[in-house]
Amino acid sequence: KNLKSPQKVEVDIIDDNFILRWNRSDESVGNVTFSFDYQKTGMDNWIKLSGCQNITSTKCNFSSLKLNVYEEIKLRIRAEKENTSSWYEVDSFTPFRKAQIGPPEVHLEAEDKAIVIHISPGTKDSVMWALDGLSFTYSLVIWKNSSGVEERIENIYSRHKIYKLSPETTYCLKVKAALLTSWKIGVYSPVHCIKTTVENELPPPENIEVSVQNQNYVLKWDYTYANMTFQVQWLHAFLKRNPGNHLYKWKQIPDCENVKTTQCVFPQNVFQKGIYLLRVQASDGNNTSFWSEEIKFDTEIQAFLLPPVFNIRSLSDSFHIYIGAPKQSGNTPVIQDYPLIYEIIFWENTSNAERKIIEKKTDVTVPNLKPLTVYCVKARAHTMDEKLNKSSVFSDAVCEKTKPGNTSK
C-alpha cells in the first residue's frame, strides 16, 4: 500500500524552541516513522533536519539546529515504513517572523506596602532575541488574591516596583513581554503570588521633589516623625532596562548621607546629563524604613523647568495673576522655548481647602473670591510635550488680601 504524506504541518517557535507538529495521513498504518529535510534560501539541496529523523510520534524538536533566524527556511516531511511517501512541502518561513516571545521569568520581593518585581527573558542568552534584548518591555496584571479585581500596568522594564499596597495581603500577578519594534506580544508567565509583610514601624519618606537653586539641586521630602536621619541614593534609569541583570548598584549622594533634615542640597555637577532614579530612606538609629518611592529625575528638564514667577492684582472678588519667566541666579529671566501649562493652587489663608486652576495662558483670573479675605496662591509649570512629561516644583506661596466689596474693575 502506498504511504500517504503527512498533512497539516505546524511550526511553533517560542524563543529558541522550534517545535514541529503534524497529522498522520493514515491512522490505520502502524509503525510509521516521519523524517524532515530543510532547505535554506538560495540553496538547491535539501539537508536532513537533525532531531526530526525517523520520528514515531507526530511532534519533533529542532531547536539544536543553529539557524540564521532572519533567513527564510523551507521544510518538507515524508512518512516511512518499508517504502516512503512522497514529500509534503511546508510553506517557507522566516524563524524570527514566526517566533513568539515566551513567558518571562519573574522574581518577587515583598515589603510592607510594596512589591519589587524583577523580570528576565524566559530564555537566557536567547539567539532569537539577541539583537532585541534591550528593546523588551513588559506588562503585567496584578490583583489581590482575596478580591480578584485586576489592575494592568503597561510598559515596564526588567525591574518595577509597585507601591501603595496593603500590608499582610497576598497579591498575585502575571507578566508578559513585548517587542514593540517587531509588533510582537508574548505569552503570560505563570501566576506568581507573594504576601506583603506586616506594617513596618517606620514609614518611608514621601513626596520627594527636586528643585534648582543657584548651582545646586535641592531635594526635599516629607516625613512623619522628628529626630530621624536620612540617606539618598541614585541609579541610572537605563539600568532598569538591562535584561537578566538584577544587581542594581544604587549610589549614595555624598551630601545626602545621614542628613538630619528633610532636605539636602548638592551641587549640580554631581550628576552628568541624564535620567536618574532617586530614593530616600529614614532611620531612627535602631530601625530603618523601607526605601521611598523612586522618583525620576531628568537633569536636562530639571535644569530648565523652574517654578513660575507671578504677580497678583487684587480685586474684591477675584485675583488677576500675571505669570512671568522664572528668574535664575543674578535675576536674569530663564527663556523657556517649549509650551507650558500652569497649575495654580489657591486657598483661603484660614482654611486648608485648596482649589486648582489649570491654564495655558500667562494671565489668569481666579474668580469667586470673598472681599477683604486673605488668599494664598502657589503655582507650578508642567511641560505639554508627552515625551518631556515633567513638572516644576511649586513656587513659594504668595498671600494677598482681596479689596473691599465695592471695588470696580
Epitope: L108, A110, D112, T197, N200, L247, K249
Partner: antibody, heavy 118, light 107 residues
Framework: EVRLQQSGAELVQPGASVKLSCTGF????????MHWVKQRTEQGLEWIGR????????KYAPKFQGQATITADTSSNTAYVQVSSLSSEDTAVYYC???????????WGQGTSVTVSS | DIVMTQSQKFMSTSVGDRVSVTCKAS??????VVWYQQKPGQSPKVLIY???YRYSGVPDRFTGSGSGTDFTLIISNVQSEDLAEYFC?????????FGGGTKLEIK
C-alpha cells in the same frame, strides 16, 4: 566557570597588618560587588564590608570601620582586604564572596586562614 | 544593626526526616533573606535567596519561607550529605548581618 581564588594562609604578629587577595575567574569583578566575611573557629559569619570595583565605593560594618580597608584592582580582576591593628580576636578564616543578582553572595572563595600570634 | 537570631544552635535529625531551621530578624526586612549551607571544612554555599527562591542546582528538598521578621528553612527528606551548618543572612540594609548558625547533626 566562575571561581574565586584567595591568597594563602598568614601568620602575623599582634599589632601588625595583613593584606589578603581574592582573584575572580570566569567573570569581571567590575560587574559585581565583592564582599569580605570573617569566620572565627566554631563561630558564625561576620560581614566586614564590600566594594563596588567599578568606582571603588565601599561599605563597612561599623565594627570593622577603621580597621579593615577593602580595595580592588580591575586590571588584575582582584579584590583585597587589609586588616590592621591585629589581635588574637582577628584569628579567623577570611572569605571573599561575589555579590551578584538580587544582592546575593553567590560565589565564595576557599577562605584564607589568618593566625595572629607572637 | 539588624540582629538575626537563630535560636537553635544544634538540631538532631535522622535520614528521611523533615527539619525546620528558624531565623528571626530584629526588624522588618521584607523578603530580603538568604540561607547558606556550610559543610565542615568548606565555604558557605547559597541555598535560598529572597526568602523563598531556591538557588540553581539546589535540591528541591530545601524550601524557604517567611517574610518580615520570621523566616524558615525546611529540609524535607533529610539526607546524610545535609550534615552542615545553616546560616540566615539579611540583605535588606547595610551592614549585612548573619544569624549565629544552626548545626544539623544526623543521628
Amino acid at each position: 566557570e566562575v571561581r574565586l581564588q584567595q591568597s594563602g594562609a598568614e601568620l602575623v604578629q599582634p599589632g601588625a597588618s595583613v593584606k589578603l587577595s581574592c582573584t575572580g575567574f570566569g567573570f569581571n569583578i567590575k560587574d559585581y560587588y565583592m564582599h569580605w566575611v570573617k569566620q572565627r573557629t566554631e563561630q558564625g559569619l561576620e560581614w566586614i564590608g564590600r566594594i563596588d570595583p567599578e568606582d571603588a565605593e565601599t561599605k563597612y560594618a561599623p565594627k570593622f570601620q577603621g580597621q579593615a580597608t577593602i580595595t580592588a584592582d580591575t586590571s588584575s580582576n582582584t579584590a583585597y582586604v587589609q586588616v590592621s591593628s591585629l589581635s588574637s580576636e582577628d584569628t579567623a578564616v577570611y572569605y571573599c564572596a561575589r555579590g551578584g543578582n538580587f544582592y546575593v553572595m553567590d560565589y565564595w572563595g576557599q577562605g584564607t586562614s589568618v593566625t595572629v600570634s607572637s | 544593626d539588624i540582629v538575626m537570631t537563630q535560636s537553635q544552635k544544634f538540631m538532631s535529625t535522622s535520614v528521611g526526616d523533615r527539619v525546620s531551621v528558624t531565623c528571626k530578624a530584629s526588624q522588618n526586612v521584607g523578603t530580603n533573606v538568604v540561607w547558606y549551607q556550610q559543610k565542615p571544612g568548606q565555604s558557605p554555599k547559597v541555598l535560598i535567596y529572597s526568602a523563598s527562591y531556591r538557588y540553581s542546582g539546589v535540591p528541591d528538598r530545601f524550601t524557604g519561607s517567611g517574610s518580615g521578621t520570621d523566616f524558615t528553612l525546611i529540609i524535607s527528606n533529610v539526607q546524610s550529605e545535609d550534615l552542615a551548618e545553616y546560616f540566615c543572612q539579611q540583605k535588606n540594609s547595610y551592614p549585612y548581618t548573619f544569624g549565629g548558625g544552626t548545626k544539623l547533626e544526623i543521628k
